[in-house]
């Protein structure tokens, strides 16, 4: 008799999820000498242990603690780049500027990037059919709790000047409900972080507006200032040119003409 299976509103676990996580772990630890000591089988076991046999609407940060412990990693605390709704450009940037790090440049972020996963209560099966959607089903699902946990830890580790890349093409450039707005902003440590510098990325070729004056940016500035952290904002009018000029700052096309 086929077992009844809970139908969730979100997509199911990414196909070949265990193999993908294990392969990514092996690749990451080969590329990053400081993480060579990591045992990827243990990492997978800890990852699996966080959600297998558990109700996918009842996951806690505590469930991920064994994985967090195994994935402990020190990144230079003054070289952190946060992002919101503009992941691809943030990753392109850290590929060029190799001494800066997004969450997805760390082992745990790299393992889970773009993947979905969930299990079922009381069975050891992975659910490849559907997983809970954050809005329609529940917020304490395996994926959301994972990202909340690693994002909080990443923000807590930051120091000095922290940078955040924001999407200037969206109606809410700063969104209080994003992971950045709901988790990272509130977990920056004022005793360690001097300044949050926002980079507002412009989409339009001819867009010369000062998006640092946008009401949502002013809201971000207010939240940050109340937390005793200085705030700074830059308009990145030409993101393609910005990446090119980060690569080669001496290129004459990077300097304003007199």
């Amino acid at each position: 008799v086929p077992r009844w299976r809970q139908q969730w509103s979100g997509p199911g676990t990414t196909k070949r999820f265990p193999e993908t996580v294990l392969a990514r772990c092996v690749k990451y630890t080969e590329i990053h000498p400081e993480m060579r000591h990591v045992d990827c089988q243990s990492v997978w076991d800890a990852f699996k242990g966080a959600f297998i046999s558990k109700h996918p609407c009842n996951i806690t940060e505590e469930d991920y603690q064994p994985l967090m412990k195994l994935g402990t990693q020190t990144v230079p605390c003054n070289k952190i780049l946060l992002w919101s709704r503009i992941k691809d450009l943030a990753h392109q940037f850290t590929q060029v500027q190799r001494d800066m790090f997004t969450l997805e440049d760390t082992l745990l972020g790299y393992l889970a990037d773009d993947l979905t996963w969930c299990g079922e209560f009381n069975t050891s099966k992975i659910n490849y059919q559907s997983c809970p959607d954050w809005r329609k089903d529940c917020s304490n699902n395996p994926v959301s709790v994972f990202w909340k946990t690693v994002s909080r830890r990443f923000a807590e580790a930051a120091c000095d000047v922290v940078h955040v890349m924001l999407n200037g093409s969206r109606s809410k450039i700063f969104d209080k409900n994003s992971t950045f707005g709901s988790v990272e902003v509130h977990n920056l440590q004022p005793e360690k972080v001097q300044t949050l510098e926002a980079w507002v990325i412009h989409g339009g070729r001819e867009d010369s507006r000062d998006l640092c004056q946008d009401p949502t940016i002013k809201e971000l500035e207010s939240i940050i200032s109340k937390r005793n952290i200085q705030f700074s904002c830059k308009n990145i009018y030409r993101p393609d040119k910005f990446l090119q000029c980060v690569k080669n700052p001496e290129d004459s096309s990077c300097t304003s003409e007199i």
Partner: nanobody, 115 residues
């Protein structure tokens, strides 16, 4: 909040010298972007008069070849030699990048040259 504040202005006789200074914070954009000195004479638009790249490559408006722009990790400096009355203006420092917009403009520093 203003991250760029020019200082060092004042009144000087024609032929004299002044050195303007501008500190900026440790954000990444300043570290990788060209910086510039701008000036705004009474009744005129603000104009870019000198730029310097991260590596120290400089460029000047023809009329200010007497000036020398320099920078380190936190400061951009403008050494103004053989000053003339037409150099009277408010001077500002800011980014001089084709990719990144100018930062919030500070108060600037006033230079007055009398003949």
């Amino acid at each position: 909040d203003v991250q760029l504040q020019a200082s060092g202005g004042g009144s000087v006789q024609a032929g004299g010298s002044l050195t303007l200074s501008c500190r900026y914070s440790g954000g990444f954009v300043f570290r990788v972007s060209s910086m510039g000195w701008y000036r705004q004479a009474p009744g005129n638009q603000r104009e870019l008069i000198a730029t310097i790249t991260v590596g120290g490559k400089t460029n000047y408006k023809d009329s200010v070849q007497r000036f020398i722009i320099s920078r380190n990790d936190t400061t951009v400096t403008l050494q103004m030699n053989r000053l003339q009355p037409e150099d009277t203006a408010v001077y500002y420092c800011n980014l001089a990048s084709t990719a990144v917009g100018a930062d919030t403009w500070g108060q600037g520093t006033r230079v007055t040259v009398s003949s």
